[in-house]
């Protein structure tokens, strides 16, 4: 088992990258002198206890920043949040910490990230630029749920 996070960069099909702004992840067009975040990701060590054929369950964090992506309900609405958390603390837990887990599915060069805690809800960005990352149930409409993930070795 790989027990150290892998690093990667993410952009969407409109070549927007993820940037951290006031503890919020937003998707913006890539520009000079911009610092896109580097993603840290690690597969859940308890993969056998999760749903099969839905994708690879992973924890998603921001490399070097002790911040991880999580899903939580605000009212009745699942929302995407950044929480201060060491990704390895999540990885080592005795059970999957589902609020921090995403099923990572790849089709060709495209990746999707589906919430394990809220099946059917995906990480997305609005088709308009400069918007925060969100969770959506509506695929391929006003929001983009397909991302390009490039691993950094």
């Amino acid at each position: 088992k790989i027990d150290t996070p892998q690093r990667g960069s993410i952009q969407d099909i409109n070549h927007r990258v993820w940037v951290l702004q006031d503890q919020t992840l937003i998707a913006v067009p890539r520009k000079d002198r911009m610092s896109p975040v580097t993603i840290a990701l690690i597969s859940c060590r308890h993969v056998e206890t999760l749903e099969k054929d839905r994708g690879n369950p992973i924890y998603l964090g921001l490399n070097g920043l002790n911040l991880c992506l999580m899903c939580a309900k605000v009212g009745d609405q699942p929302t995407l949040q950044l929480k201060e958390k060491d990704i390895m603390d999540l990885y080592n837990q005795p059970e999957p910490v589902k609020s921090f887990l995403f099923y990572h599915s790849q089709s060709g060069r495209n990746s999707t990230f589906e919430s394990v805690a809220f099946p059917g809800w995906f990480i997305a960005v609005s088709s308009e630029g400069g918007c925060p990352l969100i969770l959506t149930q509506e695929l391929g409409k006003a929001n983009t749920t397909d991302f390009g993930l490039t691993m950094l070795f």
Epitope: K85, Q93, P94, E95, P96, V97
Partner: antibody
Framework: QVQLVQSGAEVKKPGASVKVSCKAS????????IHWVRQAPGQGLEWIGR????????RYDPKFQGRATITTDTSTSTVYLEFSSLRSEDTAVYYC??????????????WGQGTLVTVSS | QAVVTQEPSLTVSPGGTVTLTCRSS?????????ANWVQEKPGQLFAGLIG???DRAPGVPARFSGSLLGGKAALTLSGAQPEDEADYFC?????????FGGGTKLTVL
Amino acid sequence: QVQLVQSGAEVKKPGASVKVSCKASGFNIKDTYIHWVRQAPGQGLEWIGRIDPAIGTTRYDPKFQGRATITTDTSTSTVYLEFSSLRSEDTAVYYCARLHYFGNNFFFDYWGQGTLVTVSS
Amino acid sequence: QAVVTQEPSLTVSPGGTVTLTCRSSSGAVTTSNYANWVQEKPGQLFAGLIGGTNDRAPGVPARFSGSLLGGKAALTLSGAQPEDEADYFCALWFSNHWVFGGGTKLTVL
């Protein structure tokens, strides 16, 4: 408030099976893991296994693999433990417990009241 | 499979401090064992006290603290109250299953 309410006491003959229920209220069982633990008279606690009610996946102590079966009915927020091929040494109080992630760790925070299973010929 | 051992009984004076321990037959207890401590008061339900070695469960008084001590998980009660008289059980995680201890009967006398 969070509650786990278990079914009543059972008396079984050796070789028989028993099915104990644990009904959850005050929380969504899909957000937690439900464990089964037993305590024989005068003994400590013994972990049997657990279920993820959202998915239905289970883990068991190797000692009980094959004899214990944990299932769930999410429509009624109920978790079941079925124990087969009962022997006299399976006489114990059987408890369900919630393992819940809070803050940074998992806690066995809430427990059922226990179900006494007596195995006697 | 590991055997988890606790002191069968301990006594503490009201206001005093006592440490309960939890030993594993498979070697030193570490943070990777995610030690949990649960309390059973006479006539009451079990209740979680500590998770992840040293995290207090919500609502648990600060007089209860968890730690690692000499290769064992430890539960320290500082300023014992009469209502702390109970049975205390530890649970340790081993890769894919939990093992509980035999319990410690704590008397506040």
